[in-house]
């Protein structure tokens, strides 16, 4: 951990319960030394992670760490699912742990699977 390798610090098993219609920022903490790496977000679809090409992203720079932010403005029901950030560094691809968004659609909350259901039946995330 003392090296200058890029580190992505998304927490293992992290999850976020959010409401459709609200704004939300998904942060990927990025530790680097000299040159800021190229970072992207992707959304898991089964075993593949589909790159999010045309979504609004930004950087937040702090003293010892930076955050690559994926903006949801607003959150939509189909934003439900698991996300991962990846960094390209010296020809290496570094991938974070996945983080899961549980989106509640307030208009049809009674029809949607609960967070507990999705935890025990993760395939509901992809239906």
């Amino acid at each position: 951990k003392e090296s200058c390798d890029v580190q992505l610090y998304i927490k293992r098993q992290s999850e976020h319960s959010i409401l459709a219609g609200d704004p939300f920022e998904l942060e990927c903490p990025v530790k680097y030394c000299a040159n800021r790496p190229h970072v992207t977000w992707c959304k898991l679809n089964g075993t593949t992670c589909v790159k999010l090409e045309d979504r609004q992203t930004s950087w937040k720079e702090e003293k010892n760490i930076s955050f690559f932010i994926l903006h949801f403005e607003p959150v939509l029901p189909n934003d439900n699912g698991s996300y991962r950030c990846s960094a390209n560094f010296q020809s290496n691809l570094i991938e974070s742990h996945s983080t899961t968004l549980y989106v509640t659609d307030v208009k049809s909350a009674s029809e949607r699977p609960s967070k507990d259901e999705m935890a025990s039946r993760p395939w509901l995330l992809y239906r």
Partner: antibody
């Protein structure tokens, strides 16, 4: 230097709700996960749950039905409510910050702890 | 949940001696999801080691962590008077996060 300070009543009656607040100073509550941990007198540590600054939570299943953790970013505070308390909930309650520089869930800053006694 | 078992419960040693504390998980916690804390009477725990072997900020080099899978070790290479305390391990591989029962390092 980040500092955490727990506050709340030191005595709660059985069946009532325990309410504690943790005030964070010397740093922002943003971009971090925050946690509550407790320690019954003379015993070990038990993780209660965490909250992200955006409001997302995760609770220990053993306490889940009785816990609410909330956050107030404008006051740089987060809070714990534990309902239907019994004598078994008597403990020192700590608030703590989850370390940023890891994908794991270690606690790098702790409050000094507050003893909550459940007794009539 | 993952149960963490620490041994021995009490370790009696003299200043200057080497302390070896053991922590065993009921199932594999990978190679790096293990933390160690020190707690002195009347104080909050203090993070010593995270990611199994990374020293937290300000922690002296005499503290080192090792291990992977289910078996982890905290080593204090030469005990100082201020090191006599209770030490806890914590796994952060699976939620809920769980702690070991602690090892008390006391002066012999």
């Amino acid at each position: 230097q980040v500092q955490l300070q727990e506050s709340g009543p030191g005595l709660v009656k059985p069946s009532e709700t325990l309410s504690l607040t943790c005030t964070v100073s010397g740093g922002s509550i943003s971009s971090y996960y925050w946690s509550w941990i407790r320690q019954p007198p003379g015993k070990g540590l038990e993780w209660i749950g965490y909250i992200y600054y955006s409001g997302s939570t995760n609770y220990n299943p053993s306490l889940k039905s009785r816990i609410t953790i909330s956050v107030d970013t404008s006051k740089n505070q987060f809070s714990l409510k534990l309902s239907s308390v019994t004598a078994a909930d008597t403990a020192v309650y700590y608030c703590a910050r989850v370390i940023l520089y890891s994908s794991g869930w270690s606690f790098d800053y702790w409050g000094q702890g507050t003893l909550v006694t459940v007794s009539s | 949940e993952i149960v963490m078992t620490q041994s021995p419960a009490t370790l009696s040693l003299s200043p200057g001696e080497r302390a070896t504390l053991s922590c065993r998980a009921s199932q594999s916690v990978s190679s790096s999801y293990l933390s160690w804390y020190q707690q002195k009477p009347g104080q909050a725990p203090r993070l010593l080691i995270y990611d199994a072997s990374t020293r937290a900020t300000g922690i002296p080099a005499r503290f080192s962590g090792s291990g992977s899978g289910t078996d982890f070790t905290l080593t204090i290479s030469s005990l100082q008077p201020e090191d006599f305390a209770v030490y806890y391990c914590q796994q952060d591989y699976n939620l809920p996060l769980t702690f070991g029962g602690g090892t008390k390092v006391e002066i012999k």
